[in-house]
Amino acid sequence: MESSAKMESGGAGQQPQPQPQQPFLPPAACFFATAAAAAAAAAAAAAQSAQQQQQQQQQQQQAPQLRPAADGQPSGGGHKSAPKQVKRQRSSSPELMRCKRRLNFSGFGYSLPQQQPAAVARRNERERNRVKLVNLGFATLREHVPNGAANKKMSKVETLRSAVEYIRALQQLLDEHDAVSAAFQAGVLSPTISPNYSNDLNSMAGSPVSSYSSDEGSYDPLSPEEQELLDFTNWF
């Protein structure tokens, strides 16, 4: 059998390899591990607490997910088909993450997080890509609502609310335009523009502003922003 696997086309991330029984680290990390080993115990302790925090976050993000069969029926011997929306794409080159050995940090009480299985890495990469697309979509929407292009900090909820109000205002203008056109054709009005047109659009410009909190990589049940989005849907 061969020494490694390679991946072609697509995929934006790295394909992590599993943690071996014997010490193991990716190449770049090997260098940093050497440097860390030479660092003071205090620095190592700081790194340890940071690493533990990172590990906890990763483990929250990597909770196992069960999936139904595509058609609601068992597929052969198990429920192994994912609905389209939850499928992951596999992430890229595994050899980027390969390293033959890992330094022993047990003296510092430091342990590196276990490498992810291929499937978990793919799922997380898929989720990262999804989040990027969502954020890109909001950025695009923000450019099309009043004040949005100038206000990059507009939150997702504010962007949606602003978009809804903007659409409603435009719809109202269309309705008014239709009414004016009909009245003009009936000979009721002279061909002058309704003064309400510009006022309606101008009133749209003042949208509330708050700090923009990114949900990049968030897998928590409901982030504050997601809760706000839920509230928004109720409002809508």
Partner: antibody, heavy 120, light 113 residues
Framework: EVKLVESEGGLVQPGSSMKLSCTAS????????MAWVRQVPEKGLEWVAT????????YYLDSLKSRFIISRDNAKNILYLQMSSLKSEDTATYYC?????????????WGQGTTLTVSS | DIVMSQSPSSLAVSVGEKVTLSCKSS????????????LAWYQQKPGQSPKLLIY???TRESGVPDRFTGSGSGTDFTLTISSVKAEDLAVYYC?????????FGSGTKLEIK
């Protein structure tokens, strides 16, 4: 009933090319990763390549990457393996297999296999 | 690469006997975050293609007789056939799907006395 049927293999010259195909039925083809696994006569199984749902990501055994290309046509429910610069060591039975593809990369269904012989 | 080692390479047993096949991996196949072992077992009867028996190290594929049991964790795994039948004559392979390249053991050939 899930069915995977590989195309006919055959005898080919070293250095030549061959394209294997696998026609799937009995399941939603585009909902699954698919793979090729080969078996040298009287020897064990060797994973060759895997492809994701829509073909945007492919994975290969390192030694085969430069010569083998896995692809799929979801409209026709067909999986392909294009092999070039064939060597005598590529002589094997090639199996098409369905990969669970979510958190499950084991192969739950296999084709009957097609035998490729590379010899002059 | 993760190397999968199976033992014995072959064994001959009588019908009704209990059989234990061993598979060891060079690296752990247990992912701590979900406590899953990324290991499967396949059965390949003479002239046939492989058939999935066990996945996640211990989950029996539907339709597989309950005399087949998978166990083990980390690097040491076992496939047990509680009472061998004549139709169990086959080669049994273990397979790690933890990471690429996916690898298989060299197989254990089960023969019936």
């Amino acid at each position: 009933e899930v069915k995977l049927v590989e195309s006919e293999g055959g005898l080919v010259q070293p250095g030549s090319s061959m394209k294997l195909s696998c026609t799937a039925s009995g399941f939603t083809f585009s909902d699954y990763y698919m793979a090729w696994v080969r078996q040298v006569p009287e020897k064990g199984l060797e994973w060759v390549a895997t492809i994701d749902y829509d073909g945007s990501n492919t994975y290969y055994l390192d030694s085969l990457k430069s010569r083998f290309i896995i692809s799929r046509d979801n409209a026709k429910n067909i999986l392909y393996l294009q092999m070039s610069s064939l060597k005598s060591e590529d002589t094997a039975t090639y199996y098409c297999a369905r990969d669970g593809g979510y958190d499950e990369d084991y192969f739950d269904y296999w084709g009957q296999g097609t035998t490729l012989t590379v010899s002059s | 690469d993760i190397v999968m080692s199976q033992s014995p390479s072959s064994l001959a047993v009588s019908v009704g006997e209990k059989v234990t096949l061993s598979c060891k991996s060079s690296q752990t196949l247990l992912y701590s975050s979900n406590q899953q072992n990324y290991l499967a077992w396949y059965q390949q009867k003479p002239g046939q293609s492989p058939k999935l028996l066990i996945y996640w190290a211990s989950t029996r594929e539907s339709g597989v007789p309950d005399r087949f049991t998978g166990s083990g964790s980390g690097t040491d795994f076992t496939l047990t056939i509680s009472s061998v039948k004549a139709e169990d004559l086959a080669v049994y392979y273990c397979h790690q799907y933890y990471t690429y390249p996916f690898t298989f053991g060299s197989g254990t050939k089960l023969e019936i006395k």
